[in-house]
């Protein structure tokens, strides 16, 4: 009864440093409260990028200072990460937790490799 989480293998950030991807989970139960966390894995270190808890049918709300935004629809979460630079290129893992009602389930995706290319500075025009 493990929970499966699917996410795209690769995403390319746009020129403004914004990357979007869908995190989809196969729920073993009827959850009413779900927590979604985006983790970044670099080498063997894992750090939290952002997290949000939401009630099914309601909007996904990240903290005001978060670099993430998102929307939910059924068992799909559309995640957007903003303000990315080339140095932020890496593997971004979607973790989904079914918080309520019991039992608790956790699912971890295989990760989305996000590539970020810093825009070239505009050449001086004479």
């Amino acid at each position: 009864k493990a929970m499966h989480v699917a996410q795209p293998a690769v995403v390319l950030a746009n020129s403004r440093g914004t990357a979007s991807f869908v995190c989809e989970y196969a729920s073993p139960g009827k959850a009413t409260e779900v927590r979604v966390t985006v983790l970044r894995q670099a080498d063997s270190q894992v750090t939290e990028v952002c997290a949000a808890t939401y009630m099914m049918g309601n909007e996904l709300t990240f903290l005001d200072d978060s670099i993430c935004t998102g929307t939910s629809s059924g068992n799909q979460v559309n995640l957007t990460i903003q303000g990315l630079r080339a140095m932020d290129t890496g593997l971004y893992i979607c973790k989904v937790e079914l918080m309520y009602p019991p039992p608790y389930y956790m699912g971890i995706g295989n990760g989305t490799q996000i590539y970020v290319i810093d825009p070239e500075p505009c050449p001086d025009s004479d």
Epitope: A2, E97, P103, Y104, M106
Partner: antibody, heavy 118, light 108 residues
Framework: QVQLVESGGGVVQPGRSLRLSCAAS????????MHWVRQAPGTGLEWVAV????????YYADPVKGRFTISRDNSKNTLYLQMNSLRDDDTAVYYC???????????WGQGTMVTVSS | EIVLTQSPGTLSLSPGERATLSCRAS???????LAWYQQKPGQAPRLLIY???SRATGIPDRFSGSGSGTDFTLTISRLEPEDFAVYYC?????????SGQGTKVEIK
């Protein structure tokens, strides 16, 4: 450095109460689920309870349901376990443990011994 | 509830030998949610392996984990004196969190 330190253990009579504490340092406490795990003398590890993030969601093992209450104070970086109606078979070393980013229990306290005896 | 059964109960080996510990689940466990812990007398458990095969920070590469479904294995390629301890497997993908009864690796 990342650390968990339990306190509050001791010898208590059956039917009485005890409150354990677990002081966390070196990490953003509110970003992690926190567990209590116990180990009776000479036996294996038994999960007791978990409390998630802001403290709203809690789960308990069947043997302690209705008797134990897990709580946390994120402003004090402290986890608690209130144990009521203690029984002989609650005698164990009690550990607090952090649920790491990927779910496994990556940080453990040193443990505190609880002995229930008349 | 997922029941984990470890075998053997005790493994008697000499330093330098290879240790193979088994953990069998009563129902399928995703490999992403299977961990191994080491515990020495008087000490707290220490995370060795998570996700069935990923070594935790600071764990030497003589420790390796494998398996999927209901059968998982912890292998210690060459036992060092400090490796003699009790080892537990645990599933953490759903509540209640459950562990095996442990395998003691003792000096022969």
């Amino acid at each position: 450095q990342v650390q968990l330190v339990e306190s509050g253990g001791g010898v208590v009579q059956p039917g009485r109460s005890l409150r354990l504490s677990c002081a966390a340092s070196g990490f953003t406490f509110s970003s992690y689920g926190m567990h209590w795990v116990r180990q009776a003398p000479g036996t294996g590890l038994e999960w007791v309870a978990v409390i998630w993030y802001e403290g709203r969601n809690k789960y308990y093992a069947d043997p302690v349901k209705g008797r134990f209450t897990i709580s946390r104070d994120n402003s004090k970086n402290t986890l608690y376990l209130q144990m009521n109606s203690l029984r002989d078979d609650d005698t164990a070393v009690y550990y607090c443990a952090r649920a790491g980013d990927l779910g496994a229990f990556d940080i453990w306290g040193q443990g505190t011994m609880v002995t229930v005896s008349s | 509830e997922i029941v984990l059964t470890q075998s053997p109960g005790t493994l008697s080996l000499s330093p330098g030998e290879r240790a193979t510990l088994s953990c069998r689940a009563s129902q399928s466990v995703s490999s992403s949610y299977l961990a191994w812990y080491q515990q020495k007398p008087g000490q707290a458990p220490r995370l060795l392996i998570y996700g069935a095969s990923s070594r935790a920070t600071g764990i030497p590469d003589r420790f390796s984990g494998s398996g999927s479904g209901t059968d998982f294995t912890l292998t210690i390629s060459r036992l060092e004196p400090e490796d003699f301890a009790v080892y537990y497997c645990q599933q953490y993908g759903s509540s209640p969190w459950t562990s095996g009864q442990g395998t003691k690796v003792e000096i022969k």
